[in-house]
C-alpha cells in the first residue's frame, strides 16, 4: 500500500494499485520502435532488439507489430496502454504472458500484432498455429 509520506498527486497514472491496494510495478519491454526484420515464414522469431525499457506507466504492456509489404519487413517493439488502441486496433490479448501474433486487416500489407504482460515478452513473437487461442484448452495453458 502507499504510505502517507508518498504524496498522491491528482490524476497520477504513475501510481497504479491492484485489488489489494499494492502498488503495481511497471512492465519491462523490448522497445526499439520500428526496425527492419528478417523474420519471415517462421513459427516464432526473436526481436533482435537490444533495448529493454521500463515502461513509463505501470498499466502499459509490451507490444510487437510485424509488417510485410512489397519492399520490406519491419518489426516494431514498444510499450503501450491497453486501454488505448494501437495502430487503430484494441490490444485484446494484453493479459497474455506470451506475444501471440494475430493478423489484422490492413490494406497493402500483411500486418500482425501481439501484446503481452510479462517481462520482455515481446522479445519472442509467436506466429505458430499451435498457440491459436480459439482452442479453449490451449487458452488455459497460455494463461497459467
Amino acid at each position: 500500500t502507499i504510505p502517507p509520506h508518498v504524496q498522491k498527486s491528482v490524476n497520477n497514472d504513475m501510481i497504479v494499485t491492484d485489488n489489494n491496494g499494492a502498488v503495481k510495478f511497471p512492465q519491462l519491454c523490448k522497445f526499439c520502435d520500428v526496425r527492419f526484420s528478417t523474420c519471415d515464414n517462421q513459427k516464432s522469431c526473436m526481436s533482435n532488439c537490444s533495448i529493454t525499457s521500463i515502461c513509463e506507466k505501470p498499466q502499459e504492456v509490451c507490444v510487437a507489430v510485424w509488417r510485410k509489404n512489397d519492399e520490406n519487413i519491419t518489426l516494431e517493439t514498444v510499450c503501450h496502454d491497453p486501454k488505448l488502441p494501437y495502430h487503430d486496433f484494441i490490444l485484446e490479448d494484453a493479459a497474455s504472458p506470451k506475444c501471440i501474433m494475430k493478423e489484422k486487416k490492413k490494406p497493402g500489407e500483411t500486418f500482425f500484432m501481439c501484446s503481452c504482460s510479462s517481462d520482455e515478452c515481446n522479445d519472442n513473437i509467436i506466429f505458430s498455429e499451435e498457440y491459436n487461442t480459439s482452442n479453449p484448452d490451449l487458452l488455459l495453458v497460455i494463461f497459467q
Epitope: 489489494n20 499494492a22 519491462l28 529493454t52 521500463i54
Partner: nanobody, 120 residues
Amino acid sequence: EVQLLESGGGLVQPGGSLRLSCAASGFTFDQDRMWWVRQAPGKGLEWVSAIESGGHRTYYADSVKGRFTISRDNSKNTLYLQMNSLRAEDTAVYYCANQNKSGRSGFDYWGQGTLVTVSS
C-alpha cells in the same frame, strides 16, 4: 521486519554528481529485483531504474539513461544509484523498493526516501 533506508541525498549544482544508497534488511535481498523510484514535488512517481537480483541486468527510464548507474552489493544488502550530470528536473525524493518473485504487484515496503535538490 522489512526495512529500507535511503541515504546520500543533498543539494548539488547542475552538472554535479551524487551517490545514493539503500540499506535493506528483513527480507532475502539477494533474491529480489530492486528499484529506484522518485517523486518530484507535486508530481507522480517516476520509475527511475531497476536491477536484477544478481546484478547482471539493469534497466533505466529514458530520462536518466547514460547519466545514472544502478548497482548492488548483495554481501552488504545495499543498493546504490550513481547520479551524474544532474539536472534541475532530477530534483525529487528518491525511494528504493524491492520487487519479489511473486510478480508485478507489491512495493509494500518504502523507506522515508532521500531528497535530492539540483539547484545553482
